[in-house]
Structure formats: structure tokens, C-alpha cells
């Protein structure tokens, strides 16, 4: 018997955001904020542990 | 069709306070942030702030000129969204508008005008 | 605040010439992540509310005509109306959504000569 697709997102898609398209999601604070308020993270030096970097993701339109 | 309708808008004296309401139909009300911006007479226009949707539970954003003087406010079951403004100046005189949020400021109302003097 | 300036404050053309107007800002908009420059420009035609016609800088709002064209990043944007008409007579605002609080420049007024 088929299946249908257990998702209609890859498994490495980014998971959809409650952001309306002019903001972006903050995942250290958890909601929306304007873009320019995230920094994207520098790289660390190899070997540095640190908690997972702010980042944003972008709703696609 | 998008359609925004303000009202509230008149005369008040220096100190005063006022109510404008932006009246939603169209779109589903909970589903999309609604901002307000004004216009002094023959001016440019000053975003004041908006209010997120349902999903991010109605948090709001302000201008800091603002703050702490106007406080933006919805009635979801009444479509309806506001815009609640103390101790008003001088200043504060101008056509008041309400926009839906979505790529930027997506849909404006006609606006109401509000007048502060004495 | 991000402070958004515009030029010309005015500009008198006739109806079929190309004409560009200038918007800057005193910090960059563009969103490295996503590539997306957070500026919108508006028109505001006499007596009536503005109008959304381009976003994240270069895209076009549905239903607005192929003769506005929006280009530019980072801290330089520019309004370009490729055929002017009559009915463009209108003030033409930018504005940034990149952080708060969203900031207008002082606007561009289209005259038809």
C-alpha cells in the first residue's frame, strides 16, 4: 500500500515562522522582531563550544 | 477586497485625550499585524507603531516618540482596531492612518484627522 | 533612528519622460541572511492615502504598472518611473522596515509640466 508524504516540507527545510514576510524570527527570544534587530553570528574559532547562534529565518512568501 | 476604515477623529483640546478606531473587513482579523501612521498637514509621514497578529499573541511595537502616550489596541471580535491617545500636544495634529502589515505597509485607510488645540 | 533622505523634494517632467528619484539611508537595510534590503516606497497621489508600490526595494505590489521600477542596496535606493503619465502626479515616500521605528524620508513630489 502507498503512503502519501509524511511532510509536505524537506527534512532540512526550515520549519515555517509565525512572522509576517516583514520581520524575521528571533529563535533566542522566540518571535518576531524587524530584521535588523538579528546579527548574523560570527564563526568561532574551531574547538569554541557556545549556545546555538541567533539567527533568523525568513517566511517564504 | 481589503478594506480599512478609520474614525475617532475631530477636535481636542491640549491635555486631552482620544479614540480612534480602524474598522476591518476583508481579511481575516487575526491573522495579520495592523499599524498606525500619521501625517501633520503638509508633511511626511511617522510611523507610530503596530500590533502583531494572534500567533504572536498581539505584542506590540512603538515609535519611541510615542510611547507611553498612545497605546494601539484590537477588537477581534468586532474587526475592529484601535488606536488610544493621552495627553495629547499640539503636535499630535494630523491625518491618522491605519495600514494592514504584511511585506511592509501593505493596505492604508482613507484616514481621520485630528485636531489638538485650544 | 534610521534616518531616510530623499531627493529631489520636487521635480517638475513631462508626460513620457523617464524619471528617478533618490532615496538614502544613514544605515545600511540590507539583511545579509536572506539578501533582502527592508525598504518600501509609496505613493501618495492629492488628497488620498498611500499607496504601496514597491517592497524589499525591487519588488513590484501586485497590480502596480511595469513603469515603476525600484533598484538600489545597503544605504542607496532609487525610484525609477520608466514613461511618466499624467496620473503619476503624486509624492513618492521611501521607507525603512529594517528596525524599529520604521522611518519615512521627507518625500519626492512628481509635478507634470
Known amino acids: 500500500m502507498r503512503r502519501g508524504p509524511r511532510s509536505l516540507r524537506g527534512r532540512d527545510a526550515p520549519a515555517p515562522t509565525p512572522c509576517v514576510p516583514a520581520e524575521c524570527f528571533d529563535l533566542l527570544v522566540a518571535h518576531c522582531v524587524a530584521c535588523g534587530l538579528l546579527r548574523t553570528p560570527r564563526p568561532k574559532p574551531a574547538g569554541a563550544s557556545s549556545p546555538a547562534p541567533r539567527t533568523a529565518l525568513q517566511p517564504q512568501e | 477586497e481589503v478594506k480599512l476604515v478609520e474614525s475617532g477623529g475631530g477636535l481636542v483640546q491640549p491635555g486631552g485625550s482620544l479614540r480612534l478606531s480602524c474598522a476591518i473587513s476583508?481579511?481575516?482579523?487575526?491573522?495579520?499585524?495592523m499599524s498606525w501612521v500619521r501625517q501633520p498637514p503638509g508633511k511626511a509621514l511617522e510611523w507610530l507603531g503596530f500590533?502583531?497578529?494572534?500567533?504572536?499573541?498581539?505584542?506590540?511595537e512603538y515609535n519611541p516618540s510615542v510611547k507611553g502616550r498612545f497605546t494601539i489596541s484590537r477588537d477581534n471580535s468586532q474587526s475592529i482596531f484601535y488606536l488610544q491617545m493621552n495627553t495629547l500636544r499640539a503636535e499630535d495634529s494630523a491625518t491618522y492612518y491605519c495600514?494592514?502589515?504584511?511585506?511592509?505597509?501593505?493596505?492604508w485607510g482613507q484616514g481621520t484627522t485630528v485636531t489638538v488645540s485650544a | 533612528d534610521i534616518v531616510m533622505s530623499q531627493s529631489p523634494s520636487s521635480l517638475a517632467v513631462s508626460v513620457g519622460e523617464k524619471v528617478t528619484m533618490s532615496c538614502k539611508s544613514s544605515?545600511?537595510?540590507?539583511?545579509?541572511?536572506?539578501?533582502?534590503?527592508?525598504l518600501a516606497w509609496y505613493q501618495q497621489k492629492p488628497g488620498q492615502s498611500p499607496k504601496l508600490l514597491i517592497y524589499?526595494?525591487?519588488t513590484r505590489e501586485s497590480g502596480v504598472p511595469d513603469r515603476f521600477t525600484g533598484s538600489g542596496s545597503g544605504t542607496d535606493f532609487t525610484l525609477t518611473i520608466s514613461s511618466v503619465k499624467a496620473e503619476d502626479l503624486a509624492v513618492y515616500y521611501c521607507?525603512?522596515?529594517?528596525?524599529?521605528?520604521?522611518?519615512f524620508g521627507g518625500g519626492t513630489k512628481l509635478e507634470i509640466k
Open positions: 476583508g481579511f481575516t482579523v487575526t491573522a495579520y499585524y
Open positions: 521607507q525603512q522596515y529594517y528596525t524599529y521605528p520604521y522611518t
Open positions: 544605515q545600511s537595510l540590507l539583511y545579509s541572511s536572506n539578501q533582502n534590503n527592508y
Open positions: 524589499w526595494a525591487s
Open positions: 495600514a494592514q502589515v504584511r511585506r511592509a505597509l501593505d493596505y
Open positions: 500590533i502583531r497578529d494572534k500567533a504572536n499573541g498581539y505584542t506590540t
